[in-house]
Interface confidence: medium
C-alpha cells in the first residue's frame, strides 16, 4: 500500500466565489475516497466535479475533486480522503 | 463513545475573559468536529462554534465572533474556548459536545461533556 | 437565522399515553447535500442534553423504539408512543442544514 500524498489549492472564480480543488496523487493500490465536506458533512455529488482516477506512470494513481465555493466560507470546507483504511481531512488554505 | 470531562464552574467579574476547557478521552481526538453550546438558565440552547481536531478549523455563530475564541490542544486531546469581554449576558452553562458524522453519516451533538456553568457578577 | 418554533410550550401526560411534539422551521431545512439534517434532544433537569432522532427519522444508537421522528420541508414531529417516567423533560429539536445551526425554544413534557 501506497498512501496517497493530498494537496489542497485554492484559485479565483466568479466574483466573491473560489473554485477550491484536492488533489491526491501518488497512490496504490487505486481505490480511493476523495470528497469535499462542509461542515464535516460530505457535499453531494453535483456539487462537486471529479477527475477520473488515472495511473501516474509510476506504478501508483491520482485523482482530484473540485467545488466552488463562497470565499468567505472557506473555513467550512475540507477535503476528506479515505483509502486503505487510512482517512485525512484537509482545509482549504489561507 | 468516549468521555468529555468539562472545567468547573467559573465565577468572573465584568469585562474579564474565561477559558473553558473540554477533556476528552475513550475516541480519536484529532477526527472530531467539537462545538460549544451556550444555555442560560430555564431557555434554550445557542450554538456558538466548532472546531476541528484535525487541523483546528473553525467556524463561528457570527453572534459569537468578538466573543468567542476556540482552540485545541491534540497532545492533551482537549478543546478550550475563550469567552472574552464578559457581561451578565453571558452567564450561563456552557457545554462542549462531539459530532458523530462517521457512525451516523450526520449526527450535530451526539456527545456531550456536563457543562459549565459561568456567573458574571460584580 | 433559521428560526425553530415548538408546540406546545407545555405538554402534560400521563404515563403510558402518546405524546406528539411539533417543530416548525422559518424556511426548508435542506441542506445542499440533500439531507435533512432536523434532529430532536431531550433534556432532564440538572443534565446536558441527549440526542434522540438525527436526520429527521433515524433513532441515535440506545434510543428506545418509542421515540419516532418524522416530517419534511417545515413541518417535523416527534412521537412518544408510551411515554415512561424516564421520558419527562424537556424536548428541543434542532436544525444543522443553515449556519447559524439553532434550536427551538423547548416542549416540556410532564406528569398532568
Known amino acids: 500500500t501506497v498512501p496517497p500524498m493530498v494537496n489542497v489549492t485554492r484559485s479565483e472564480a466568479s466574483e466573491g466565489n473560489i473554485t477550491v480543488t484536492c488533489r491526491a496523487s501518488s497512490f496504490y493500490p487505486r481505490n480511493i475516497i476523495l470528497t469535499w465536506r462542509q461542515d464535516g458533512v460530505s457535499l453531494s455529488h453535483d456539487t462537486q466535479q471529479w477527475g477520473d482516477v488515472l495511473p501516474d506512470g509510476n506504478g501508483t494513481y491520482q485523482t482530484w475533486v473540485a467545488t466552488r465555493i463562497c470565499r468567505g466560507e472557506a473555513q467550512r470546507f475540507t477535503c476528506y480522503m479515505e483509502h486503505s483504511g487510512n482517512h485525512s481531512t484537509h482545509p482549504v488554505p489561507s | 463513545q468516549g468521555q468529555m470531562q468539562q472545567s468547573g464552574a467559573e465565577l468572573v467579574k465584568p469585562g474579564a475573559s474565561v477559558k473553558l476547557s473540554c477533556k476528552t478521552s475513550?475516541?480519536?481526538?484529532?477526527?472530531?468536529?467539537i462545538s460549544w453550546l451556550k444555555q442560560k438558565p430555564g431557555q434554550s440552547l445557542e450554538w456558538i462554534a466548532w472546531i476541528y481536531a484535525g487541523t483546528g478549523g473553525t467556524s463561528y455563530n457570527q453572534k459569537f465572533t468578538a466573543k468567542a475564541q476556540l482552540t485545541v490542544d491534540t497532545s492533551s486531546s482537549t478543546a478550550y474556548m475563550q469567552f472574552s469581554s464578559l457581561t451578565t449576558e453571558d452567564s450561563a452553562i456552557y457545554y462542549c459536545?462531539?459530532?458523530?458524522?462517521?457512525?451516523?453519516?450526520?449526527?450535530?451533538?451526539?456527545?456531550w461533556g456536563q457543562g459549565t456553568l459561568v456567573t458574571v457578577s460584580a | 437565522d433559521v428560526l425553530m418554533t415548538q408546540t406546545p410550550l407545555s405538554l402534560p401526560v400521563s404515563l403510558g399515553d402518546q405524546a406528539s411534539l411539533s417543530c416548525r422551521s422559518s424556511q426548508n431545512i435542506v441542506h445542499i447535500n440533500g439531507n435533512t439534517y432536523l434532529e430532536w434532544y431531550l433534556q432532564k433537569p440538572g443534565q446536558s442534553p441527549k440526542l434522540l432522532i438525527y436526520?429527521?427519522?433515524n433513532r441515535f444508537s440506545g434510543v428506545p423504539d418509542r421515540f419516532s421522528g418524522s416530517g419534511s420541508g417545515t413541518d417535523f414531529t416527534l412521537k412518544i408512543s408510551r411515554v415512561e417516567a424516564e421520558d419527562l423533560g424537556v424536548y428541543y429539536c434542532?436544525?444543522?442544514?443553515?449556519?447559524?445551526?439553532?434550536f427551538g425554544g423547548g416542549t416540556k413534557v410532564e406528569i398532568k
Open positions: 436526520k429527521v427519522s
Open positions: 434542532f436544525q444543522g442544514s443553515h449556519v447559524p445551526w439553532t
Open positions: 459536545a462531539r459530532h458523530d458524522y462517521y457512525g451516523t453519516s450526520g449526527a450535530w451533538f451526539a456527545y
Open positions: 475513550g475516541f480519536t481526538f484529532s477526527d472530531n468536529y
